[in-house]
Amino acid sequence: QESLSCDASGVCDGRSRSFTSIPSGLTAAMKSLDLSFNKITYIGHGDLRACANLQVLILKSSRINTIEGDAFYSLGSLEHLDLSDNHLSSLSSSWFGPLSSLKYLNLMGNPYQTLGVTSLFPNLTNLQTLRIGNVETFSEIRRIDFAGLTSLNELEIKALSLRNYQSQSLKSIRDIHHLTLHLSESAFLLEIFADILSSVRYLELRDTNLARFQFSPLPVDEVSSPMKKLAFRGSVLTDESFNELLKLLRYILELSEVEFDDCTLNGLGDFNPSESDVVSELGKVETVTIRRLHIPQFYLFYDLSTVYSLLEKVKRITVENSKVFLVPCSFSQHLKSLEFLDLSENLMVEEYLKNSACKGAWPSLQTLVLSQNHLRSMQKTGEILLTLKNLTSLDISRNTFHPMPDSCQWPEKMRFLNLSSTGIRVVKTCIPQTLEVLDVSNNNLDSFSLFLPRLQELYISRNKLKTLPDASLFPVLLVMKIRENAVSTFSKDQLGSFPKLETLEAGDNHFVCSCELLSFTMETPALAQILVDWPDSYLCDSPPRLHGHRLQDARPSVLECHQ
């Protein structure tokens, strides 16, 4: 049998060692013990007796099915206990009694049906993170389950086979920063929502089929809910259930962020937020994020005119990888407060973008992200966006553009342009001179000779440049990132000619370790201040005898350098 490996600070690794029991020879010097992925099955009362100073104990996926009642009695210093993904079909309060220092407890993925006969956690007054439940058997949440817990940073409950939720079970925890609920359906959602309304700041609902969700007024007094963020991940919605969900918002007046991630909408966007009060109650929502929204009938999707008024005050919208091909002009015009819009990984083309960015569209927009769409003409794109008078930042990376022309028009306030991964081979004066930040990384550029008088940051990594660009092109440059090109050398004169340069990232190039380069690096210890990833990413490519050596360590031969 293999043994533990421990370092000087008492951190011991026993993962995947085929242990069939807790190994012998544990000592009080151990601070952290990881016995995950073993076949331990049983923890006896003396097995951990010697570990009086243990702070971290990780026993996940070790096939444990039995733990003696007093197995953890000597672990008064324990702060982190992970028993996840074992075979514990019942849980005992006697395990946790001695663990008064515990801050993190993971009991998830064990096949218990309830959290035990009596309250498990009354002594865990320092607990900050608790993870419980499983996919298949955890079926009941009761009032006694969380007794003794008053405040948690994170609570995660996997209750994907929940059959009974005893009203007020979660109410005893007065403050929960982040609650993650895995519920397969909405049966108990209203009851749970009522119980957590006054305690949870961030509610994350996972894997829930909300297709049959129906609102009914909550049995709560006037509450001031601290909830700021609400996220749905892997949920299923219909047009009708979306309308019903909106009615919950009247109880969370401080809500500022809503997120839908990997959700399915079995509908056409025929939303009808009938309650006029819902509109005013969305007033504080500033950020709406939608990622990977699957709409089986997306080609029949409505124009969303019924929710225009809901979104008038929203400042940040992300709709990513969701088959968006058009934001109707009238919708864009209603997004009066929008400052940030991210439409990455969608189906936008110039023709429809023109409609989206019509006159009066997105009047407050400062940042637009159109990365990985189907844009082809840089010139057309710039022209279309001239309507956006406040646009300062544009990301059109990961679109495959035709070669750029010599001149283009862009919104006059634009300061940041991302053209990375667009297949460009040559940069021309199409790029606006007003830029302060330009990203052209991951393209096919073998030179860069464009004068950009205001440019402060240039990102040009993963191209084919053989030398650093001429410093006179960028009189106020502060940052240049030029990793993974074909740069063979840089000199004192080159670096000195960038008067304001503070950061240069030039690692992973093909450095020719000449006498000049090596003597420069040896004589200039201050390089470490300016070069990012120095010295590890700066390696000699040639001559052959120095190949793979760090520039810092390479020594030129006396013969070569003093001929």
């Epitope: 499983n134 299923v236 990977r292």
Partner: nanobody, 122 residues
Framework: EVQLVKSGGGLVQAGGSLRLSCAAS????????MGWFRQAPGKEREFVAV????????DYASSVKGRFTISRDNAKNTVYLEMTSLEPEDTAVYYC???????????????WGQGTPVTVSS
């Protein structure tokens, strides 16, 4: 209506690997949560793994976690169960199932495959 057809079972030595697949007919495959269950002789049917509609979420029974991997290909209307480090205790008839709810509770699945036997010899 979704019909489920399975393949890939058989006899394997302890420590070996097998890949089960379950092909669905019909064009609505991507609307379903897919699960794998198994039933050993003389025992109740038990949950093995579940995957959501997009493939972005997966969950496993603790007895197979780290050894089995569930995946799906919506373009091919197929769900897979990759089984490695097989043990004699994994011997059972394996079923794939389709339903509307992401759960390990077999009663919530509406459509079932016919089952394929897996025998792990020591």
């Amino acid at each position: 209506e979704v019909q489920l057809v399975k393949s890939g079972g058989g006899l394997v030595q302890a420590g070996g690997s097998l890949r089960l697949s379950c092909a669905a007919s019909g064009r609505t495959f991507s609307r379903y949560i897919m699960g794998w269950f198994r039933q050993a002789p003389g025992k109740e049917r038990e949950f093995v793994a579940v995957i959501n509609r997009s493939g972005g979420s997966t969950d496993y029974a603790s007895s197979v976690k780290g050894r089995f991997t569930i995946s799906r290909d919506n373009a091919k209307n197929t769900v897979y169960l990759e089984m490695t480090s097989l043990e004699p205790e994994d011997t059972a008839v394996y079923y794939c199932a389709a339903g509307e709810y992401y759960t390990g509770s077999s009663s919530r699945y509406d459509h079932w495959g016919q089952g394929t036997p897996v025998t792990v010899s020591s």
